[in-house]
């Protein structure tokens, strides 16, 4: 059985049927700072993939996951809840051989790793550690835990407007 | 909508290079894999490599002994991949692909055709 | 390498009915960390180049339509048309994208019967 629910994830995501939006990589910004996507009518921010409704930011440079975390509520996003084989295989295609913190946290008390929507992952996190309560994906097809002190990028996603 | 438009034909004779361009357009071509991919007349396809044009990071197909070299100018969106040392099982046609591991979107080849 | 091999080499399905493609790989595509197989179908017409038609093993791709399903699990894999068309007719091929070399199989050509 696969990890992934569709109804799991606190939003709603759209099937896209036909070709897949995307934002048009040569356009310029309009004033406001976002770019509109080829169909739907949604928008992007500059520098923001889009991908069924919802919009991703890959950072290059590197934080912490609190940092991470701060940075993405700072973009009105948060940190990526990779739990549809659609949304795995996007970021698969788009990240690039590093390490990015996702939105997935181990809770002691629990013993279970979880979204920061709180809902349960029920994959398996490789490289576990007692010390590593965060989470990566990006250089290897895992889910692998991390210390939530080191800095890795990140990757962030909010709803298209 | 997403668009891979490759280069023409090309004939070469053994021992010569070829390059094949794939220029991309409709998304943001720095942040997606771009593989490429050969067909050799009536066979099955073959993975050659990919590269991330964003930073220039690459994966071959050990197969292909350093022959293969993949580039990206993200100026223009146009990704590259030169063949050196061609034999005649060289002839193909090639393909550029996005994605990293399995590829929605494919150019629409470029034959290669290798002879003395 | 990881080996693919398709069977059958041919298949002639009458219009309507069910064509099932099977693909066997020579080690597991099973990802133990997010549960998926890395395992995809592509179709291809004369002339054109493959297309995405499923990935992880049982995935859609958007827009294909829900006649092709695919199934299996660790190194067994089919694919289904569930009612054949005559656009259907093509050489199929699956591909393991489980780790590099990532590599396809032979491929089945679909006919009409």
């Known amino acids: 059985p696969q990890i992934f629910n569709k109804s799991n994830d606190g939003f709603t995501t759209t099937r896209s049927y036909g070709t897949v939006s995307q934002i048009f990589g040569s356009s310029s910004p309009s004033p406001n700072g976002f770019i509109t996507t080829r169909s739907y009518g949604t928008v992007c921010p500059k520098d923001w993939e889009f991908y069924q409704a919802r919009c991703f930011f890959l950072s290059t440079s590197e934080s912490s996951w609190n940092e991470s975390r701060d940075f993405c509520k700072g973009k009105g996003s948060t940190l990526a809840i990779v739990n549809t084989p659609e949304k795995l295989k996007f970021l698969q295609d788009i990240t690039d051989a590093e390490k990015y913190f996702i939105g997935l946290i181990y809770h002691r008390e629990e013993k279970r790793w979880r979204w920061i929507n709180n809902s349960v992952f029920n994959g398996n996190v490789t490289n576990q550690n007692q010390n590593f309560n965060c989470a990566t994906i990006g250089l290897t097809k895992t889910f692998d835990a991390a210390s939530c002190d080191i800095s890795y990028r990140r990757i962030c996603e909010k709803n298209a407007k | 909508q997403v668009q891979l438009v490759q280069s023409g034909a090309e004939v070469k004779k053994p021992g010569a290079s070829v390059k094949v361009s794939c220029k991309a357009s409709?998304?943001?071509?720095?942040?997606?894999?771009l593989g490429w991919v050969r067909q050799a007349p009536g066979q099955g396809l073959e993975w050659m490599g990919d590269?991330?044009?964003?930073?220039?990071?690459?994966y071959y197909n050990e197969n292909f002994k350093g022959r293969v070299t993949m580039t990206t100018d993200t100026s223009t969106s146009t990704a590259y991949m030169e063949l050196r040392s061609l034999r005649s099982d060289d002839t193909a046609v090639y393909y550029c692909?996005?994605?990293?591991?399995?590829?929605?979107?494919w150019g629409q080849g470029t034959l290669v055709t290798v002879s003395s | 390498d990881i080996v693919m091999t398709q069977s059958p080499d041919s298949l002639a399905v009458s219009l309507g009915e069910r064509a099932t493609i099977n693909c066997k790989s020579s080690?597991?595509?099973?990802?133990?960390?997010?549960?998926?197989?890395?395992l995809a179908w592509y179709q291809q017409k004369p002339g054109q180049p493959p297309k995405l038609l499923i990935y992880?093993?049982?995935t859609r791709e958007s827009g294909v339509p829900d006649r092709f399903s695919g199934s299996g699990s660790g190194t067994d894999f089919t694919l289904t048309i569930s009612s054949l068309q005559a656009e259907d007719v093509a050489v199929y091929y699956c591909?393991?994208?489980?780790?590099?070399?990532?590599?396809f199989g032979q491929g089945t050509k679909v006919e009409i019967k």
């Open positions: 692909a996005r994605g990293k591991e399995s590829f929605a979107y």
């Open positions: 409709g998304y943001g071509f720095n942040n997606y894999w």
């Open positions: 590269i991330y044009p964003g930073s220039g990071n690459t």
């Open positions: 080690q597991s595509l099973f990802n133990f960390s997010n549960r998926n197989n890395y």
């Open positions: 992880f093993a049982s």
């Open positions: 591909q393991q994208h489980f780790t590099t070399p990532y590599t």
